[in-house]
Amino acid sequence: IRLVPPYPSSQEDPIHIACMAPGNFPGANFTLYRGGQVVQLLQAPTDQRGVTFNLSGGSSKAPGGPFHCQYGVLGELNQSQLSDLSEPVNVSFPVPTW
């Protein structure tokens, strides 16, 4: 999980977060969490290992805490197998200087 450019400079700017699964799991389903709450879900195309979550401006006003990714794949008997949560990513904004 990582923040990708363009980086937000204020709480109104969009946030872009990339999440990647290991090589065994292209086409995985990804869930982005913030402070333990689901923010967005995306499925990678079958030929891709990751996704980029694009959060519209103001998303940073959602419940606080760092962002985490989790990916899931369908296993035997069509049961979803989930990864551990990723390392956290924190989004910070520059302090304005007047």
Epitope: M20, P22, Q48
Partner: antibody, heavy 116, light 107 residues
Framework: QMQLVQSGAEVKKPGASVKVSCKAS????????FSWVRQAPGLGLEWMGW????????KYEQKFQGRVTLTTDSSTNTAYMELRSLRSDDTAVYYC?????????WGQGTMVTVSS | DIQLTQSPSFLSASVGDRVTITCRAS??????LAWYQQKPGAAPKLLIY???TLQSGVPSRFSGSGSGTEFTLTISSLQPEDFATYYC?????????FGQGTRLEIK
């Protein structure tokens, strides 16, 4: 420690097939995919294909489609690459690699020479 | 398919120099880029993945940066053992293409 040990060098005639093996140790075999990469003498790295140890899915570079087959055997922790209809320009070192978030463990390479 | 172009193809430098190698992708690949080092007669070695994450055991003089279509590998102070060929690779979309390589030689 994590290790990939490949089978020995091969000399083949044009039109023949070759099957290279790659035995993994030091980690859980089914948690990581494999890719195969080749390098012709004096040239760069060329990705050939990928196989998931999770479900056996494969993806191949278009130029090798129909000529290469990747398989794995989780009972022996071994991955295989078979290349058919060999040509002289298939002469190269063939590497198996553990495919995680990148290619983090490489085999020592297997030299395949195609010559009449 | 995505194309990767490395520059320069050849680089001559001295021990202690700071060197930068660039890898450009023909379309956006997020931060899904890796860098490898290869010495003659040996298998490549992973240096950096996810554009900027240093692989365990790799000296901190190696660093990576970039996102989207432009990426760089920087060696802050060249050591004698760093003279080798360097490859970038995209891991965003299959096929998992490599750049053509940059040969780094002693000046």
């Amino acid at each position: 420690q994590m290790q990939l040990v490949q089978s020995g060098a091969e000399v083949k005639k044009p039109g023949a097939s070759v099957k290279v093996s790659c035995k993994a140790s030091g980690y859980t075999f089914t948690t990581h995919a494999f890719s195969w990469v080749r390098q012709a003498p004096g040239l760069g790295l060329e990705w050939m294909g990928w196989i998931s140890t999770y479900n056996g899915n494969t993806k191949y570079e278009q130029k090798f489609q129909g000529r290469v087959t990747l398989t794995t055997d989780s009972s022996t922790n071994t991955a295989y690459m078979e290349l058919r209809s060999l040509r002289s320009d298939d002469t190269a070192v063939y590497y198996c690699v553990r495919d995680s978030r990148a290619f983090d463990v490489w085999g020592q390479g297997t030299m395949v020479t195609v010559s009449s | 398919d995505i194309q990767l172009t490395q520059s320069p193809s050849f680089l001559s430098a001295s021990v202690g120099d700071r060197v930068t190698i660039t890898c450009r992708a023909s379309q956006g690949i997020n931060s899904y880029l890796a860098w490898y080092q290869q010495k003659p007669g040996a298998a490549p070695k992973l240096l950096i993945y996810a554009a900027s994450t240093l692989q365990s055991g790799v000296p901190s003089r190696f660093s990576g940066s970039g996102s989207g279509t432009e990426f760089t590998l920087t060696i802050s102070s060249l050591q004698p053992e760093d003279f080798a060929t360097y490859y970038c690779q995209q891991l965003n979309t299959y096929p998992l293409i490599f750049g053509q390589g940059t040969r780094l030689e002693i000046k």
